[in-house]
Amino acid sequence: FNISGCSTKKLLWTYSTRSEEEFVLFCDLPEPQKSHFCHRNRLSPKQVPEHLPFMGSNDLSDVQWYQQPSNGDPLEDIRKSYPHIIQDKCTLHFLTPGVNNSGSYICRPKMIKSPYDVACCVKMILEVKPQTNASCEYSASHKQDLLLGSTGSISCPSLSCQSDAQSPAVTWYKNGKLLSVERSNRIVVDEVYDYHQGTYVCDYTQSDTVSSWTVRAVVQVRTIVGDTKLKPDILDPVEDTLEVELGKPLTISCKARFGFERVFNPVIKWYIKDSDLEWEVSVPEAKSIKSTLKDEIIERNIILEKVTQRDLRRKFVCFVQNSIGNTTQSVQLKEKRG
């Protein structure tokens, strides 16, 4: 199809080479098309549409994304050619940064229902650049945490070194929905609830004498509880003796609950004590069996191919540790009688 009639938007993604970050493109169909379409009323209702009304479908996923190759080849369907780019309804998610994401992206409705709809498309010219170190020493991260129940703020990474007074107007979206009152370089949250978690996008306009473009950053916000003040506790084994049958295989499970820590480095391991000797046992990897906002339960098993007489003289010790401290639970094997 002819893309010369598409409205055009220029975007800049300046990514940090230090951290993983994502990026998104919204299918910004001109008003009133997108309200038919993506159910996202992102502009003022008083803004005059640039195009004739689009008689669109209400199906949220009814848009098609293409990339325009720089060599002039035909448009490529994003879904077929780019595994690191995911389409979610009207949004295109870039899972990994890199200058190779630079290019022109076109979105338009899948279903063309009237002659006017042919021109109902948006061309987004995306420029991707690595961030220069010089700009800002303490720029905000693309992953930000809000402490539940307290006051917090979400900073736009590309503007976090700007004073509030000098910050340009910022357009914020949360999970693709416009936050119309938020126009500053940071969102202040009076009291943090779990619904403040999500994907936030901040846009601002940069211009020179020739043209203007939108600088965009994506922030993943999670809501967290305060770091635990407790060392982990062992939920299993509870008893310090375990009845076993000689010659049979045995699995002993160690389950421990670790309180939330922002920097989480849990340790869970098994070691064996035999008279004056003790050594760590090579056991299968630990696995998380339950994770909540406040804590995580991690399990690690020790597996004996068959229980020997020697095992009855040993102590099997589960050791767990977080940044606060450690806990141990030892198990002595006892032969089943009868």
Epitope: L43, P168, S180, E182, R183, V189, D190, Q206
Partner: antibody, heavy 113, light 110 residues
């Protein structure tokens, strides 16, 4: 800096356009607002034009005001002034979050027959 | 429509004293979007406090904003002669069309 102009004496019903001339920053990057103050009275937010050009107005304006902008100016059109519109009109750099960082000195509009 | 009610008005304070101006909102402001302005005769307003409690740059720390939801306070400690002015609160609301200023509180310094 910001500087309003276009104020003066006007007869009721005669459309009037006030202009705010900006320098030192780009209107394509900042939201701009208009606020007015009747003599001896308090401040009233009229409306805001966003960096991208979309406009938001106070509910009491009821379509009597229109905000628009060019490259270095922001206009406030009073479509059909009444005597109640007599006030000093300020333009300010700031948005619908009611954070107005920089203000012009204001221009006085007197509506009288 | 939203209403911001400021009390008391006028208010008087001695030099070196402390004064509090209250601003009550109906309904609640959006998030923490309550600002305070100082205006002297013949001048445009000046932003003092934004987002309820953040001090604008260049504003002395004698000015303090507090509160949330529907109840906000501007406290001026160690009052100076230069603080004589009218103080306005301003609130932002969901949908923006209800955005408004309070009626103002005139402060006289004795």
């Amino acid at each position: 800096s910001l500087k309003e102009s276009g104020g003066g004496l006007v007869t009721p019903g005669t459309p009037l356009t006030l202009t705010c001339k900006v320098s030192g920053f780009s209107l394509s990057s900042y939201d701009m607002s208009w606020v007015r103050q009747a003599p001896g009275k308090g401040l009233e937010w009229i409306g805001t034009i966003y960096d991208g050009g979309s406009t938001y107005y106070a509910s009491w304006t009821k379509g009597r005001f229109t905000i628009s902008k060019a490259s270095t100016t922001v206009d406030l059109k009073i479509t059909s002034p009444t005597t109640e519109d007599t006030a000093t009109y300020f333009c300010a750099r700031g948005s619908t979050n009611m954070e107005f960082w920089f203000w012009g000195p204001g221009t006085l509009v007197s509506v009288s027959s | 429509a939203a209403v911001l009610t400021q009390t008391p008005s006028p208010v008087s304070a001695p030099v070196g004293g402390t004064v509090s101006i209250s601003c009550q909102s109906s309904p609640s402001v959006y998030s923490v979007y309550l600002s305070w302005y100082q205006q002297k005769p013949g001048q445009p307003p000046k932003l003092l406090i934004y987002r309820a409690s953040t001090l604008a740059s260049g504003v002395p720390s004698r000015f303090k904003g507090s509160g949330s939801g529907t109840q906000f306070t501007l406290t001026i400690s160690d009052v100076q002669c230069d603080d004589a002015a009218t103080y306005y609160c301003a609130g932002a609301y969901v949908g923006s069309s209800d955005n408004t200023f309070g009626g103002g509180t005139e402060m006289v310094v004795k």
